[in-house]
């Protein structure tokens, strides 16, 4: 009954600082309303990253001023984290949550090592 | 700091009606479910009701469903309990608690008690 | 819903001693729901695990978890005086969320 995630064991952002990776889940029931979130875990402390909700067939959207976008298809949501630096390298965990219609459904993954490497900066020309 | 604090309880008469409080403080309220669950004297825990985010998903135990209404005021991080047609049943020491980010129950009340009797 | 039993009731044992808690579900329960709290007398429960073998925030390291499937377990590795208090387990993978019935470690 339990609802299972899966996502990437690694993913390398590119030198423009955005990583993306697929977050899937096996849902236990015919869930209309589901919740994504992505936290961060480092030290054993966990913060959240980005979250939204969305209506299966519709797209998910974050807030404005998130630093996540993503697309959605049945079970599958494609993640795109921006604006990340190589101090932001860690794990980040794919939490969803079977909103609606009940009964409410927890899902945590494994966790996607981000490596982040801040790009060289652009010798000087004379 | 992180907490929670429980008001409202007290000794009821059953088929009354009863609002139970509690005020968060020291985090982002509206980022996190937040539960109810209680405990009768001498007994074990029982989970009652949880609140998502926003407030429109909400989910009951069996034994309090129809009777008991959760909800939460964001703004105020404040989450509610609205009991009805109480029950001797439903006497025990009532804790909120926070669902941790991760989904266990991190962060608890110190608990508030309502006894109902005649 | 996914009933947790716990064994046994009552643990006695003596400072210094190990003591292993038992908590077995009804169906599979993913490790990853699967937490622990202490409870003393007149007090709110406390998480120690959760996700079935992690350590909450300040929980010393003489407390572990461990199991998967419908068999877990809680090994307080030497009790300490304040190790005694009632243990709760608890899934939180599935509405209704449930605990078990306590298991109650007191002084021998």
């Known amino acids: 009954k339990a609802m299972h995630v899966a996502q990437p064991a690694v993913v390398l952002a590119s030198s423009r600082g955005i990583a993306s990776f697929v977050c899937e889940y096996a849902s236990p029931g015919k869930a209309t309303e589901v919740r994504v979130t992505v936290l961060r875990q480092a030290d054993s402390q966990v913060t959240e990253v980005c979250a939204a909700t969305y209506m299966m067939g519709n797209e998910l959207t974050f807030l404005d001023d998130s630093i996540c976008t993503g697309t959605s298809s049945g079970n599958q949501v494609n993640l795109t984290i921006q604006g990340l630096r190589a101090m932001d390298t860690g794990l980040y965990i794919c939490k969803v949550e079977l909103m609606y219609p009940p009964p409410y459904y927890l899902g945590i993954g494994n966790g996607t090592q981000i490596y982040v490497i801040d790009p060289e900066p652009c010798p000087d020309s004379d | 700091q992180v907490q929670l604090v429980e008001s409202g309880g007290g000794v009821v008469q059953p088929g009354r009606s009863l609002r139970l409080s509690c005020a968060a403080s020291?985090?982002?309220?509206?980022?996190?479910?937040v539960h109810w669950v209680r405990q009768a004297p001498g007994k074990g825990l029982e989970w009652v009701s949880v609140?998502?985010?926003?407030?429109?998903?909400?989910f009951y135990a069996d034994s309090v469903k129809g009777r008991f209404t959760i909800s939460r005021d964001n703004s105020k991080n404040t989450l509610y309990l609205q009991m009805n047609s109480l029950r001797a049943e439903d006497t025990a020491v009532y804790f909120c608690?926070?669902?941790?980010?991760?989904?266990?129950?991190?962060?608890w009340g110190r608990g508030t008690m309502v006894t109902v009797s005649s | 819903e996914i009933v947790l039993t716990q064994s046994p009731g009552t643990l006695s044992l003596s400072p210094g001693e190990r003591a292993t808690l038992s908590c077995r579900a009804s169906?599979?329960?993913?490790?990853?729901?699967l937490a622990w709290y202490q409870q003393k007398p007149g007090q709110a429960p406390r998480l120690l695990i959760y996700?079935?073998?992690s350590r909450a925030t300040g929980i010393p390291d003489r407390f572990s978890g461990s199991g998967s499937g419908t068999d877990f377990t809680l090994t307080i590795s030497r009790l300490e005086p304040e190790d005694f208090a009632v243990y709760y387990c608890?899934?939180?993978?599935?509405?209704?969320?449930?605990f078990g019935p306590g298991t109650k470690v007191d002084i021998k």
């Open positions: 608690a926070r669902g941790a980010l991760l989904g266990a129950f991190d962060i």
């Open positions: 608890q899934q939180y993978g599935i509405s209704p969320f449930t």
């Open positions: 996700g079935a073998s």
């Open positions: 020291g985090f982002t309220f509206s980022s996190y479910g």
């Open positions: 609140i998502l985010y926003d407030g429109n998903n909400k």
């Open positions: 169906q599979s329960v993913s490790s990853s729901y």
